[in-house]
């Protein structure tokens, strides 16, 4: 087997739910409305819901390991390893994944992590001056005429590795794509490795929150005691691709057995059976009731 | 099956070089971070460096940083340690092993056989 | 650098007796904690994983509790065959330290 059978640092147990109670939940979340929605897609990314006053949140209780492996998530972020990025996903509950290992480019000051263990974590770079805020690596040039943010990123060393965009157009590696965000001052994201396709709906690429601005940084290395992360799992052997037919192939550690994790819509053991049902929940002080 | 050989081992002289290296088979070497540990005669286990994945993260035991360089080639499926300005003290059997570190890590699942360095003058 | 710290370095036991060994991190390391079991001149073997999981293989009476800086490997009954040296290691970060050792005997 390609697959270590022992060794995770990850801990099991139910969805925990507040005073003291525990809800047989695994991806809930928080509508704001009476009635709230608790299913797979309003809490996806390994969220889980915690009932939080009268009504329930959607919690990302991830413990992870502090060793400095940097990944690059498809939203042009540098992640210490790939459990920040993943909790990272479920915070900003938003599909991030990984599309290279190691930092997303060489000259974000994060480093090769020779020597290194822990992300910097640090804050967006701007330049606040007369140029007003500068975003996305690019850098304000005052002695210009037209005073304007300027950018200086240099993907001219990148070898041809075609992505495709949140803006819905092709770049030949995703140096471009820092490039045109930092041109255009707007979040662009990469969608996928390889060029743009006709199935590439714009409208569902979708742009980023401008409220969660470039960071070149190595993201979410925040404190690791607020949550506690349930993980017991690795990628499943090369023998076993297909297991899955509509989610992903997990190797769980401690069973030594391959499981599924089933995308939303669908259920059974390699996720070959469409799922209906929807799970509503309406708070009330006495206890969750579903309707 | 999964096998970790080590080679390179020997007797050198104080201040001289020494490169170990460790062929890894019957996995998928680039899913895995390669570590060396060493064992000095009669004495416990000691964690010397790791290489993680595409050689791109890097750490060292405080006693061999800037002397021992860990390296890894993927399209051989072989780990390096490149060891400079060796020290009586470095003399001990080396130990290649593999851990996986994703979502969630993992400790030494499998070793090698060791290899012996004997640093003396 | 977090240091691991073993007791006893050694201990002798009658085959049947109840084992424990301790291990302690001078910071919190959640449950990334393994242990290892090295027979004289053979590789080490994992034998606990994330503090208290069983590795595949490896015999029931090996149990392993703790998290936090505090970690405690016992073996129900023990065998001729237990006879080694037991190491703790740490994986939540670099580097990844072992503990000391605890040499293990039968009387």
């Known amino acids: 087997s390609n697959q270590p059978p022992g060794g995770g640092g990850g801990s099991g147990g139910d969805c925990p739910g507040g005073k003291g109670k525990s809800i047989n939940c695994s991806e809930l979340n928080v509508r704001e409305s009476d009635v709230r929605v608790c299913d797979e897609s309003s809490c996806k990314y390994g969220g889980v819901c915690k009932e939080d006053g009268d009504g329930l949140k959607c919690a990302c209780q991830f413990q992870c390991h502090t060793n400095y492996i940097p990944v690059c998530g498809s939203n042009g972020d540098t992640y210490q390893n790939e459990c920040f990025l993943r909790r990272a996903a479920c915070k900003h509950q938003k599909e991030i994944t990984v599309i290279a290992r190691g930092p997303c480019y060489s000259d974000n000051g994060s480093g090769s992590g020779e020597g290194e263990e822990e992300g910097s974590g640090a804050e967006v770079h701007r330049k606040h001056s007369k140029c007003g805020p500068c975003k996305y690596k690019a850098e304000c040039d005052e002695d210009a005429e037209n005073v304007g943010c300027v950018c200086n990123i240099d993907c001219s060393g990148y070898s041809f590795n075609p992505v495709c965009a949140s803006d819905g157009s092709s770049y030949n590696n995703p140096c471009f794509v820092r490039e045109a965000s930092c041109i255009k001052q707007e979040q662009i994201d990469i969608r996928h490795l390889g060029h743009c396709t006709d199935t590439d709906d714009t409208s569902l690429l979708g742009k980023k929150d401008d409220g969660l601005q470039y960071r070149p940084d190595v993201k979410d290395a925040s404190d690791q005691r607020e949550d506690v992360y349930i993980g017991n799992h690795m990628p499943c052997p090369e023998n076993l691709n297909g297991y899955c037919i509509h989610g992903k192939c997990e190797f769980i550690y401690s069973t030594q057995k391959a499981s599924c994790r089933c995308e939303s819509g669908y259920t059974g053991q390699h996720c070959e059976k469409t799922d209906f049902s929807i799970l509503y929940v309406v708070p009330s002080r006495q206890k969750l009731t579903h309707v | 099956q999964v096998q970790l050989v080590e080679s390179g081992g020997g007797v050198v002289q104080p201040g001289r070089s020494l490169r170990l290296s460790c062929a890894a088979s019957?996995?998928?070497?680039?899913?895995?971070?390669m570590h060396w540990v060493r064992q000095a005669p009669g004495k416990g286990l000691e964690w010397v460096a790791v290489?993680?994945?595409?050689?791109?993260?890097?750490f060292y035991i405080d006693s061999v940083k800037g002397r021992f360089i860990i390296s890894r080639d993927n399209s051989k499926n072989t780990l390096y340690l490149q060891m400079n300005s060796l020290r009586a003290e470095d003399t001990a059997v080396y130990y290649c092993?593999?851990?996986?570190?994703?979502?969630?890590?993992?400790?030494?699942?499998?070793w090698g056989q060791g290899t012996l360095v004997t640093v003396s003058s | 650098d977090i240091q691991m710290t073993q007791s006893p370095s050694s201990l002798s036991a009658s085959v049947g007796d109840r084992v424990t060994i301790t291990c302690r991190a001078s910071?919190?390391?959640?449950?990334?904690l393994a242990w290892y079991q090295q027979k004289p001149g053979k590789v080490p073997k994992l034998l606990i994983y994330?503090?208290?999981t069983l590795q595949s293989g490896v015999p029931s009476r090996f149990s392993g509790s703790g998290s936090g800086t505090d970690f405690t490997l016992t073996i129900s009954s023990l065998q001729p065959e237990d006879v080694a040296t037991y190491y703790c290691?740490?994986?939540?970060?670099?580097?990844?330290?072992f503990g000391q050792g605890t040499k293990l005997e039968i009387k």
């Open positions: 092993a593999r851990a996986y570190c994703g979502d969630d890590c993992y400790p030494f699942d499998y």
């Open positions: 019957g996995f998928t070497f680039t899913s895995y971070g």
């Open positions: 290489v993680w994945y595409e050689g791109n993260s890097k």
């Open positions: 910071q919190g390391i959640s449950n990334y």
């Open positions: 994330a503090a208290s």
């Open positions: 290691q740490k994986y939540n970060s670099a580097p990844w330290t």
